[in-house]
């Protein structure tokens, strides 16, 4: 007769026997019998299985292809896959990080709101009034306009989102 309930956690039912699943890092060689427990074997080099399982083949570790801008962030074990990330200056194109693209630069008139990481691109924001950015950069924030008054100077040319103000000496001839 079948067991009154399903087999326990970490077990599977086959041929009226509750067999133990193979533990993470091991693959199934043969199902259990009444007299022998499930036969399991450790995954080979560069292979893994990350759950209790009845898989007959282990999965290959992910390859971090340097030609796609990838490098190893965390080496895989028999129980975990390799985690890839991107080379400096690049970020993943997807959550799975299968390829990389160059970090976006923020154009003049825009500053960096959030610097890119290995998994996210640069976030740019327009420079608000009183701030400017005159370079294309993946790191530079918007800079505040120079305060001419604190230097005892006057504004000779107004600033824009791309240019700083130009300060000059006060006109001494004015009464």
């Amino acid at each position: 007769p079948e067991p009154p309930t399903a087999c326990r956690e970490k077990q599977y039912l086959i041929n009226s026997q509750c067999c133990s699943l193979c533990q993470p890092g091991q693959k199934l060689v043969s199902d259990c019998t009444e007299f022998t427990e499930t036969e399991c074997l450790p995954c080979g080099e560069s292979e893994f299985l990350d759950t209790w399982n009845r898989e007959t083949h282990c999965h290959q570790h992910k390859y971090c292809d340097p030609n796609l801008g990838l490098r190893v962030q965390q080496k895989g074990t028999s129980e975990t896959d390799t985690i890839c990330t991107c080379e400096e200056g690049w970020h993943c194109t997807s959550e799975a990080c299968e390829s990389c693209v160059l970090h976006r630069s923020c154009s003049p008139g825009f500053g960096v709101k959030q610097i890119a990481t290995g998994v996210s691109d640069t976030i740019c924001e327009p420079c608000p009034v009183g701030f400017f950015s005159n370079v294309s950069s993946a790191f530079e924030k918007c800079h505040p306009w120079t305060s001419c008054e604190t230097k005892d100077l006057v504004v000779q040319q107004a600033g824009t989102n791309k240019t700083d103000v130009v300060c000059g000496p006060q006109d001494r001839l004015r009464a």
Epitope: P3, T5, C7, Q17, S20, T38, C40
Partner: antibody, heavy 123, light 107 residues
């Protein structure tokens, strides 16, 4: 409370019989295989017998085969060990033990044990 | 039957010590090995199953490792309540068999 309580042990003469009982509570008794494990005074542990949830898989250690009989009554949440033709070498504390699986009495490990009952075989 | 050989048979240690007990199977048993703790006059208590998985409620200072024929139980920092006898047991094939035990004593 999840527990196993053995009873029925005592002093018995060689060649005589004894019946051990194990009362289970706090878990669904008929979901699990059950076993008897013994321990001679000052010695290690020895598996004696096991029975599947449905009593269709019953197995014994060679040392007790033909003399001991394991059985269970799921309606009473009870496990039994009938011991006949007892010998001095059967002297031990007998533990009732629960198996985390259900389907075989031939192998397993033991995630819950009773406190044991002492069987002394001596003339 | 599969023979289980434990070593050492006894070990003297102090509170805070790291203690390692080994168990060797006479045949390959995959990872089907359990470890038990037994205190005098008490029933054995399951510590570890499938060679390395901690039973619910067991302190994390206990750990198990190994696969195939060679297995280890480690107590990372011995506590006063850990002085006891430890047994390994294979459940790979019929009949289940135990190691001879390792007594952990106070130095």
């Amino acid at each position: 409370e999840v527990q196993l309580v053995e009873s029925g042990g005592g002093l018995v003469q060689p060649g005589r019989s004894l019946r051990l009982s194990c009362a289970a509570s706090g878990f669904t008794f008929d979901d699990y295989a059950m076993h008897w494990v013994r321990q001679a005074p000052g010695k290690g542990l020895e598996w004696v017998s096991g029975i599947s949830w449905s009593s269709d898989s019953i197995h014994y250690a060679d040392s007790v085969k033909g003399r001991f009989t394991i059985s269970r009554d799921n309606a009473k949440n009870s496990l039994y060990l009938q011991m006949n033709s007892l010998r001095a070498e059967d002297t031990a504390v007998y533990y009732c033990a629960k198996d985390p699986t259900a389907t075989t009495g031939a192998r397993g490990y033991f995630d819950l044990w009773g406190r044991g009952t002492l069987v002394t075989v001596s003339s | 039957d599969i023979q289980m050989t434990q070593s050492p048979s006894s070990v003297s240690a102090s509170v805070g010590d790291r203690v390692t007990i080994t168990c060797r199977a006479s045949k390959v048993i995959s990872s089907w090995l359990a470890w038990y703790q037994q205190k005098p006059g008490k029933a054995p208590k399951l510590l570890i199953y499938a060679a390395s998985y901690l039973e619910s409620g067991v302190p994390s200072r206990f750990s198990g490792s190994g696969s195939g024929t060679d297995f280890t139980l480690t107590i990372s920092s011995l506590q006063p309540e850990d002085f006891a006898t430890y047994y390994c047991q294979q459940h790979s094939s019929f009949p289940p068999t135990f190691g001879g035990g390792t007594k952990v004593e106070i130095k």
